[in-house]
Interface confidence: low
């Protein structure tokens, strides 16, 4: 089936670019992990078998290319064990301060909303402002979703200027553009520090027994979204005879409709993004995307959120990431003590 083989090609491309050697091996050597992946990806039996064979070959290629993958994982784990306690206390402090800031906003002006915050360098397609991009960068090169890049700070500054300008002129000392800006930027920097060290091998140090469930279902959800995007591309009436590749931009007119899931994948939130630039945004990217503003036309039609709520959301998202990292830290520590 040509449709099926095109999907397999796309899936292999995804695995090559987005999934570490260690995670691919985990998926292929653990039956439970594989079954979880197949279920999450909603793959028919024949496609699952075909993909399995293709991944078998890919795994061998990846190992030949990256003979030191295991040693690298150990190096990252050691670094994380050493550095995490400091990062944790700094992040906790930032989260506390963000919450205090949110409480202050609420008291001063309960009805204030965030308006016109969408900054070109940070928005994905139709107006989602994605503030924190750590977790994307390690998996994409030169793509439109590599947010932690030179110029990102400018985008955040622009966004926060929007928040702190005309729509909330409280004249209160505690609420300043600098404060909000500094807090979020500092939090980003802490997580960025982890991201920069781990580089493309972030998932090497996340391959811990406790994460297998989320890891496999995370990859599965992205493959499912990719498969559906592919299927929907095929059904577009004016699709070119040569069949557009998934690696080409999907336009808003393409009719792509992806099912909403509990943890929205970037694939599900974007219409104007290259699929090759879309990193897996499910669990195993612990340094996941934190959304400052849900101003998306196709996720929250016309919704305008209160500033305080949005700041709380940032704090909550940061806290969730911190909790996951903290859990990994505990697992790694226990391993070390054996």
């Amino acid at each position: 089936d040509p449709e099926s083989s095109i999907f397999i090609e796309d899936a292999i491309k995804y695995f090559k670019e987005k999934v570490s050697t260690q995670n691919l091996l985990l998926l292929l050597t653990d039956n439970e992990a594989w079954n979880g992946f197949v279920a999450a990806a909603e793959l028919p039996r024949n496609e699952a078998d075909e993909l399995r064979k293709a991944l078998d070959n890919l795994a061998r290629q990846m190992i030949m290319k990256d003979k030191n993958w295991h040693d690298k994982g150990q190096q990252y784990r050691n670094w994380f064990l050493k550095e995490f306690p400091r990062l944790k206390s700094e992040l906790e402090d930032n989260i506390r301060r963000l919450r205090a800031l949110a409480d202050g906003v609420q008291k001063v002006h309960k009805g204030t909303t965030i308006a016109n915050v969408v900054s070109g360098s940070l928005s994905i397609s139709s107006g989602i402002l994605t503030l924190v991009g750590m977790g994307l960068a390690p998996f994409t090169e030169g793509g439109s979703l590599v947010l932690l890049e030179p110029g990102m700070e400018l985008g955040i500054t622009a966004a926060l200027t929007g928040i702190t300008s005309s729509t909330m002129d409280y004249g209160k000392k505690w609420w300043t553009q600098a404060q909000a800006h500094d807090l979020v930027i500092k939090s980003l920097d802490k997580l960025k520090e982890v991201r920069e060290f781990l580089g493309e091998n972030i998932s090497n140090f996340l391959s811990l027994a406790g994460n297998t469930y989320q890891l496999t279902r995370g990859i599965g959800k992205d493959i499912r979204a990719l498969r559906r995007a592919r299927a929907n591309l095929q059904s577009v009436p004016h699709a070119s005879a040569s069949r557009p590749r998934v690696t080409e931009p999907i336009s808003a007119e393409s009719g792509e409709q992806v099912e909403r899931v509990n943890e929205p994948s970037i694939l599900e939130m974007s219409r104007g993004v290259k699929l090759t630039d879309v990193a897996p945004v499910s669990f195993f990217l612990v340094l996941d995307v934190v959304y400052l503003v849900y101003e998306s036309k196709h996720l929250h039609e016309g919704a305008k959120s209160e500033t305080a709520e949005e700041l709380k959301k940032v704090a909550q998202e940061l806290e969730e990431k911190l909790n996951i990292l903290n859990n990994n830290y505990k697992i790694l520590q226990a391993d070390q003590e054996l």
């Epitope: 985990l26 292929l28 050597t29 653990d30 992990a33 078998d56 061998r60 027994a209 391993d335 054996l338």
Partner: antibody, heavy 121, light 111 residues
Framework: CQSLEESGGRLVTPGTPLTLTCTVS????????MGWVRQAPGKGLEWIGI?????STHYASWAKGRFTISKTSTTVDLKITSPTTEDTATYFC?????????????????WGQGTLVTVSS | AIEMTQTASPVSAAVGGTVTINCQAS??????LAWYQQKPGQRPKLLIY???TLESGVPSRFKGSGSGTEYTLTISDLECDDAATYYC?????????????FGGGTEVVVK
């Protein structure tokens, strides 16, 4: 210092289930695959099976149903469900190299001293 | 099921000489092959894995080669201490059933 020590080997009568235990020291069993290999007196090495770091098991075709491998955080067990006289051998527990997987191949670079199982009526 | 077949024992050579031991898998094992040395009353020792990679601490006199179904262990500049039984082992488990991952063993006698 990393080490493996097998225990539980003894004289048993045919049909009496026997569990051999490999106690590991200084080894994180969630990072390494572990295998069981046996050697009958004067014969060659015979692979029984392995348990991967994630806990999945692979057995030699002749060993399926006759042996069960399981693990805790510090031990790896080999249960001989219904021993016969042909199961008389020294049983070795072995740890796979770091990074050993189904794709890189499982290679054993650390071995226990072995424990002798004698099955006789 | 995958079967491993080794050169018949014994193989003998003089000190300073070279011995070659062959190992054949009944189907491709994708270079997932190891060689072990075992002396009487001792546990096996890993020499080579991945068909040709030398385990740390093993002298470079030991050389592994081969791919697919055919593999070779070559011991050059033989020493008395090399007298032992050598086993090949398929590290490729899964997909195909395996009767015994180990070959039958080849005894090397150093004269």
């Amino acid at each position: 210092c990393q080490s493996l020590e097998e225990s539980g080997g003894r004289l048993v009568t045919p049909g009496t289930p026997l569990t051999l235990t490999c106690t590991v020291s200084g080894i994180d069993l969630s990072s390494y695959a572990m295998g069981w290999v046996r050697q009958a007196p004067g014969k060659g090495l015979e692979w029984i099976g392995i348990i991967s770091s994630s806990g999945s098991t692979h057995y030699a075709s002749w060993a399926k149903g006759r042996f069960t491998i399981s693990k805790t955080s510090t031990t790896v067990d080999l249960k001989i469900t219904s021993p016969t006289t042909e199961d008389t051998a020294t049983y070795f527990c072995a740890r796979a190299r770091a990074g050993s997987t189904y794709y890189t191949g499982y290679y054993f670079n650390l071995w226990g001293q072995g424990t002798l199982v004698t099955v006789s009526s | 099921a995958i079967e491993m077949t080794q050169t018949a024992s014994p193989v003998s050579a003089a000190v300073g000489g070279t011995v070659t031991i062959n190992c054949q898998a009944s189907e491709s094992i994708y270079s997932n092959l190891a060689w072990y040395q075992q002396k009487p009353g001792q546990r096996p020792k890993l020499l080579i894995y991945g068909a040709s990679t030398l385990e740390s601490g093993v002298p470079s006199r030991f050389k592994g080669s081969g791919s697919g179904t055919e593999y070779t262990l070559t011991i050059s500049d033989l020493e008395c201490d090399d007298a032992a039984t050598y086993y090949c082992q398929s590290g490729y488990y899964g997909i195909s059933a395996i009767n015994n991952a180990f070959g039958g063993g080849t005894e090397v006698v150093v004269k």
